[in-house]
Structure formats: C-alpha cells, structure tokens
Interface confidence: medium
C-alpha cells in the first residue's frame, strides 16, 4: 500500500509545509543555496506558532542554526530572503541584548531561546523551507509511511 | 533601581495639543531590545495602548489614533515624549509610560509609571 | 486588530476561594500574553508573561496557562492582598489589553 507523505524523506510537516533541519554545517550565503538545489528556500518565519515550532527543534538540538534573515543590504532593517521586513511582533524573538551587530554580525540565527544575529561566513546548520505536497495529483509524491514527526506544543 | 516618571500638563482644553514626556532611569533606550510604551486609562475604565518607540527609533501608533500621535526619544536625556493632537473630553483619562524588556520572551510591559492624571475640559 | 475578552467581568469571592479569570483572544497568538493586576489609583503590575511564566517576586499561588486563542489566569487560594482588578494583554501583533475582571469580596 502506497501511502502519501506530504514531505520528502527527513523533512518534518508543519501547518502545510516541509522543513529540512540540516546535519551538516555551511556558512549563510551557501545555506541559501543549499535550500535553493533542493527546491526550498532558507527558512522566513511567518507566524509566531512557526516560529514557535523551529526554535523548538533548533534549541532541542542544541544546534546554532541559520534561518533566511538578515540585515546586509542596510544595517539595522532587518529582511527576510524572500524580501518581506521583519514584522514589529518578531521583534520579541531576539535573545536579551541582540541584534548587537557586534564584528559586522548580519545575519540571524537560532540560538538558544531565541534569535542572534553572527558573521554570515560562520559555519552553521541551517533550515530549508518549501510548501508541502497535497498528494492530489499523480506527480505528488507516494511514499512509504515516514517516521511520524507529530507537532509539538507551542514553548 | 528602575524608574518611569510621567509628566505633563493635568489640564488642557478641547482642540489643544498634550505634549507628555516619560523620564526613566535605570536602563538605556540605546539597549537592544528595550521599548517603551505609552498605555492611557480613562477613568473607570480599560487599559488602552496607544504608542511604541523601540530602541532602534522604530515607532507604532494604535491604529484608531495613530493620525493624532507622535512618540519620539532623546536617549541622552532618557525621555520619551508622546503628543496627542486635537484633544477631545473622552481623552480624559489617566496617562502611563511602561518599558519592555529585552530578551525573547515577549514585549510586554514589566515595569510602569505611576500615571498622569489629563483632564480635557473647557 | 487583535481583541481580547476576558470574562467574566466582575467575580465575587472569599479569601481562600480558588479563582479563574478566562481570556479568549479573537485570532491565535500562541503563547504571547501577559497578566496584569491593578488596584484603584495604582499603575498596573506584572504578573505573568508569555502566558504562564511568573514574573520574579510574584507569589506562586498566580498561575497562568493557554495557547492560541484561550487563557487563564488561577489564583489558587485568595489572599485579601488579591482583591484587584486584573487584565490580560496580548503583544502578538502589536499590543491590545482585554476589558478587565474587578475580583471583589463576596
């Protein structure tokens, strides 16, 4: 029996979208490309339960991990790689003290509770983003049943 | 220790404008993270936001008064000044500046002024 | 705009009584909401943040729990010090407060 998986292999679904929590590291220009070669984008955070959700598995890993914000075409506007600004309420998202821009940090990361903004040429982990599959055509992806990955509660 | 002291007119007449100025100590507006905010309550009545200003000069106005409201800062003198254009009787009500902290648990209000009274009255 | 409506308005009670003060909020804003308590002349005093974190110094008899559209603030056992007038506000997207609940001795 074909079941269908919404995901590729190793991602995780949440609210109609595939995540991929990578195992290797990459600085942040080539986490963009990393996420752009599997068809997804570096991740930009919509919502405060999506927030919720990725700072959930970035700080139960206890990895440093890259999402798609940064502050390098003006210092101190923050923007999303899809273009959009980052929005008043997410300003809430930023650990105690940062952004501090400390050595030209324009980048933004996972880190801990929370987000920092780092030197983009660190190396990193990273989280591609891409909408999830509907399975309603016969081009969706058909699967055998992937490890379950349920929602956790909001942090 | 960590203070805010509203202060500005108690009296103003229909049509004026309320200029209000929050002095803090205790903590710079220059720190990433901080806000403050000002929060109005007539009497008897709701609590009411009606500014921000973050520490990076960003500014957010209520949307129901956002024509009449300015927020501005002076980091060097740690004051913050909200004015309110065209006063009306049901702007009457009590005036609070409150901070936000910084850190990733959310921008609430952890510390406030007493209050300033404003009574719009001709 | 978010709205939050807390209920019910007014809650009568005796020291001792266990007391819920509901919040629903209009559209879900996950975990961001704060807990007030104010007494008559006296500025607003944090209780609880991001919806059940208690703020230092606030006695552990206020607990605060709820995610996306529904809150509620417990105060286990009612102290006299307790009889005040509590408000939640959400900072989701950007900052409304609810109407208030006048906890008053019964």
């Known amino acids: 029996e074909r079941l269908c998986h919404p995901c590729p292999w190793e991602w995780t679904f949440f609210q109609g979208n595939c995540y991929f929590m990578s195992n290797s590291q990459r600085n942040w220009h080539d986490s963009i490309t990393a996420c752009k070669e599997v068809g997804a984008q570096l991740v930009v955070i919509k919502s405060a339960e999506e927030q919720n959700f990725l700072q959930l598995q970035s700080s139960r890993s206890n990895r440093f991990t890259w999402m798609g914000l940064s502050d390098l075409n003006q210092e101190g506007t923050w923007q999303w790689v899809d273009g959009s600004p980052l929005l008043p309420s997410f300003k809430q998202y930023w650990n105690r003290g940062e952004p501090n821009n400390v050595g030209e940090e324009d980048c933004a990361e996972f880190s801990g509770n929370g987000w920092n903004d780092d030197k983009c040429n660190l190396a990193k982990f990273w989280i591609c983003k891409k909408s999830a599959a509907s399975c309603s055509r016969d081009e969706e992806q058909f699967l055998s049943p992937a490890p379950a990955t349920p929602n956790p509660p909001p942090a | 220790q960590v203070t805010l002291r509203e202060s500005g007119p108690a009296l103003v007449k229909p049509t004026q404008t309320l200029t209000l100025t929050c002095t803090f100590s205790?903590?710079?507006?220059?720190?990433?993270?901080?806000?403050v905010s000002w929060i109005r309550q007539p009497p008897g009545k709701a609590l009411e936001w009606l500014a921000l200003?973050?520490?990076?000069?960003?500014?957010y106005y209520s949307t129901s008064l956002k024509t009449r409201l300015t927020i501005s800062k002076d980091t060097s003198k740690n004051q913050v000044v909200l004015t309110m254009t065209n006063m009306d009787p049901v702007d009457t009500a009590t005036y609070y500046c409150?901070?936000?902290?910084?850190?990733?648990?959310?921008?609430?209000?952890?510390?406030w002024g007493r209050g300033t009274l404003v009574t719009v009255s001709s | 705009d978010i709205q939050l409506t807390q209920s019910p308005s007014t809650l009568s009670a005796s020291v001792g009584d266990r007391v819920t003060i509901t919040c629903r909020a209009s559209q879900s804003i996950s975990n961001w909401l704060a807990w007030y308590q104010q007494k008559p002349g006296k500025a607003p005093k944090l209780l609880i943040y991001k919806a059940s974190s208690l703020e230092s110094g606030v006695p552990s008899r206020f607990t605060g729990s709820g995610s996306g559209t529904e809150f509620t603030l417990t105060i286990s056992s009612l102290q006299p010090d307790d009889f005040a007038t509590y408000y939640c506000q959400q900072y989701n997207s950007y900052w409304t407060f609810g109407q208030g609940t006048k906890v008053e001795i019964k």
């Open positions: 200003i973050d520490w990076d000069d960003d500014k």
């Open positions: 409150a901070r936000t902290p910084s850190g990733s648990y959310g921008r609430y209000f952890d510390l």
């Open positions: 205790g903590f710079s507006l220059s720190t990433s993270g901080i806000s």
